[in-house]
Amino acid sequence: AIVFIKQPSSQDALQGRRALLRCEVEAPGPVHVYWLLDGAPVQDTERRFAQGSSLSFAAVDRLQDSGTFQCVARDDVTGEEARSANASFNIKWIEAGPVVLKHPASEAEIQPQTQVTLRCHIDGHPRPTYQWFRDGTPLSDGQSNHTVSSKERNLTLRPAGPEHSGLYSCCAHSAFGQACSSQNFTLSIADESFARVVLAPQDVVVARYEEAMFHCQFSAQPPPSLQWLFEDETPITNRSRPPHLRRATVFANGSLLLTQVRPRNAGIYRCIGQGQRGPPIILEATLHLAEIEDMPLFEPRVFTAGSEERVTCLPPKGLPEPSVWWEHAGVRLPTHGRVYQKGHELVLANIAESDAGVYTCHAANLAGQRRQDVNITVATVPSWLKKPQDSQLEEGKPGYLDCLTQATPKPTVVWYRNQMLISEDSRFEVFKNGTLRINSVEVYDGTWYRCMSSTPAGSIEAQARVQVLEKLKFTPPPQPQQCMEFDKEATVPCSATGREKPTIKWERADGSSLPEWVTDNAGTLHFARVTRDDAGNYTCIASNGPQGQIRAHVQLTVAVFITFKVEPERTTVYQGHTALLQCEAQGDPKPLIQWKGKDRILDPTKLGPRMHIFQNGSLVIHDVAPEDSGRYTCIAGNSCNIKHTEAPLYVVDKPVPEESEGPGSPPPYKMIQT
C-alpha cells in the first residue's frame, strides 16, 4: 500500500518569496506523484514546479496560490492511488495603491468650508496600520479639524480650508512589511485672493515668418495682474517691447501674439499671474521654430517575385515630427491591399514583376517637404541566350566557352571545372557576359565544365565537355647540350606526343647517317661505346600525319669524366703555421678547381694575403688561426661533369715543451711543420 512518509502541511508564506510543500511517498511499485489545487492538476511553471515529489514555489502569489493543495500518489504496478492531507498557505502581503478623493465626488466640488474625505488604497494581509502625511509631514490622529479612521483607511478634513491645501500621501505597515501610496493627491482649496490658472499657455511650433499665439489667463478676487517675460527676463508689454520682439502684442485677455517669427524669437516665454495675496504663479511655454532635415539615401533594392518585402522609410529629424507617406508613379499608396503603406514601411506582398520601379518616400511638416526615391528591381530567373557547347580546343591556344544568359538584375555567372569552382587567375578569365576564357589550353583542361547563372530569384546551369586537341610536341623537350662519357655506353632519349602518336627518329645535323654502333630505338639514341667521333650535332624528328613534323637539335659532347689524382687529407696545424690542402683533378675538358671553406666558395680574386690557390689546385693558408678550422671542399668541374671531395682542417695551440723533454722529442700528433 502507498504510505505518505511526509505530508504537506498548511503554513504561513510571504508574497513573492520561496515556499515548499513537502510530500514523500513509499510504495511497492514505481510511483507517479502529482499535485492538485482545489481538485485540479497543478501544471509546472517557472514559478511553481514539482521538485521530486514535493511542490516548490519560487515566488508565492496570493492570487494563484490561494486554495487547497493535495499531493496525489499512484502506484504504477498495483494501480493504487492515495491522496495526502490538504494544505494551504496563509499568504502575508502588502500592496501599494493611490490616495483618492472619496468625498465629495469630484475635485470640482471641493469648496472652502466643505468636508473632504481621502482614502488610502494600500491593502494587505494581515490588515496594515496607516499613517497620513501632508507635504511629507506626518498628521497625528486627533489634531484639530481632521480625523483618521484606520479601519476605513480614511482621512477626513472638516471643514476644509486653504490651510489644508497640499500634497497628501499615506504609508501602511504590517507584519509583512511596509508600502507607501503609489499616487498622491493634491488638495487645492483656493483662497479667492490667490491667483488661479484658468488657461495655461501651450508649447507651439511655427514655420519661419508665420505667427504664434500663446494664451494665458488667471482668476482671483480682486482680479490678478498678468505679465509676460521672454527668456532673458525681459518684460513684454505693448509699450515696452525688447528689440528682438518688435512684432509682439499682448491682448487684454492675456494672450500674446508674435508675428513674422524669426529664429531669435524661439525660446521660453513665461506668463506670471499675481493675486492680491499668495505666491506668483509662473507658467512656461516654448516657441519652437519648425525644421526638417534631409532624408537619408536608399540603397537600390532587389526582390524576388512571389515574396513579401518591406522598405522602411526613416523620417528625417524635424519639428514637429514629420508625417511620412509613400508614392509610386505619382500616386499615394493606400494603407491596405497588395502594395500598401504600413506605418513608415512600404509593404509589397506577393511581389509581381510589374511592381518594379521607383517608389518615393515623402516626409513633410510645417518647415517643408523632403523626398527620397528607392529603385526596386524585381529579380527574374535567368534564361538562356547561349548555353556552353561541347568543344574541341587546341592546346597552347586560348579557348572559349559561352554562358550567355539574361535576367533582371544582370545575372552573376560562375564556372565549375570537375565540380570545383574556377577562381579567376592567370589561366582563367570570366568575361562580363559570362564567357569563360582559358588563356593557354593545356592537355589536362580536357574535362567537364559547368556554368551557373544566378540572380536572387534563382539560377540555371548547363555543362559542356572540353576535348583538347593536343599539339605535336616533345615531352619533354631534349636538353640542347648533353655530355657522354668517353668509352662508356650512353643513351639520349627523345619522346613526343600529338593528336596521333608520332613517329620519332634521330639523324645527324649534317644529314649523314648514324654509325652502326649507334642505334635509334623508338626515339632513344643508343651508343654502345662512346668514341670521340660521336661528338657533334644531332636532330630528333617527331612527325605524324595530321600535324607534320617538329625537330629538336642536340649538341653531344664526348668527355672524360672527372677523377681526383690527389685528394685533400685530414690536416692538423699549429696556430700561426702554414696549412697546405692538396687537390688535383683530371678529365676532358680539363677541369677547373674551386675551394669551399666554412660553407662559402673561396673566390680567388678576394682571398687576401693569407690564402692562395695554386695552378695545380692546391690551397695554402699562411699564419693559420683557430677560426680557419673546419671542413674544406675541393670542387672540380668542367662543362660536362662536377665532382667534389672534402677534408677537415684542425688548428691547435703549440704545446709549451717541458724541462724533461729533449729538443728532438716528437709532437703528440701528426703535424704539418713549416
Epitope: 511499485g29 514505481p30 504504477d76 504496478v77 493504487e80 492511488e81 492515495a82
Partner: antibody, heavy 113, light 111 residues
Framework: QVQLQQSGAELMKPGASVKISCKAT????????IEWVKQRPGHGLEWIGE????????NYNEKFKGKATFTADTSSNTAYMQLSSLTSEDSAVYYC??????WGQGTTLTVSS | DIVLTQSPASLAVSLGQRATISCRAS??????????MHWFQQKPGQPPKLLIY???NLGSGVPARFSGSGSGTDFSLNIHPLEEADTAMYFC?????????FGGGTKLEIK
Amino acid sequence: QVQLQQSGAELMKPGASVKISCKATGYTFSNYWIEWVKQRPGHGLEWIGEILPGRGSTNYNEKFKGKATFTADTSSNTAYMQLSSLTSEDSAVYYCARGKQYWGQGTTLTVSS
Amino acid sequence: DIVLTQSPASLAVSLGQRATISCRASESVDNYGISFMHWFQQKPGQPPKLLIYAASNLGSGVPARFSGSGSGTDFSLNIHPLEEADTAMYFCQQSKEVPRTFGGGTKLEIK
C-alpha cells in the same frame, strides 16, 4: 486474493452499442485505477484509458474519445466500458486490468452484420 | 504520443541459450529517476502477464531467468537460460504519460 472477472463474449451489429463489465474482488475497489486495453489480431495491444472508481476520475486515449465511456459502481465493485457506434474495427478482445499486475480474462467482441 | 519500437519482431533461440529483446522509446520515459518502462509476456488465449516493472524490477512470481535493463529511451529484456515454457509474445509498455503505449510485440520461439 485479487480477481477481475469480465463479462462474456458479445456479437453485435454495426451501429449498436455494447457495455462490457469487469467485477473486482479481493481489494478496496474505490482506491485502485482500472485500465482498459484492446487487442486485435495483428494489431498488438492498445491502451483505451482508465478510471478511478472512488472518485470517478478518468483518462482517455485521444483515439478512443467518443468511442469508449468508463463508469464504475462502487456498491457492486464493478467497472464498465461502453463502446458506441460499433464498426468491424471494434471487433477485438478487451481486457480490464488493475494497474499492471492483475488482468481480467478478456471479453471478445465481434461486430458483424 | 510516445512511440515504442520493439526489435526484433520475432526470434528463435535454442533451449538454454540467451534471448534479448529491445525496446526503443521516441522520447525519454524517465521521471523522478524512475524509468516507467514495463515488460509483459502473453501466451495464446491468455491476458498479458507482468514480467518486469520500472525497467529492471522482477514482477511477483516471475523466475529470476528474466531480467530487464536500460534507461531513458533504450531498454532490453533478457531471458537466460531459455526454457520451453518461454515461447510467447513479449510486449514493452511505457506509463510515463497518457496515453500509455505498447510496443508492437516480439514473438519468441524455441529452436
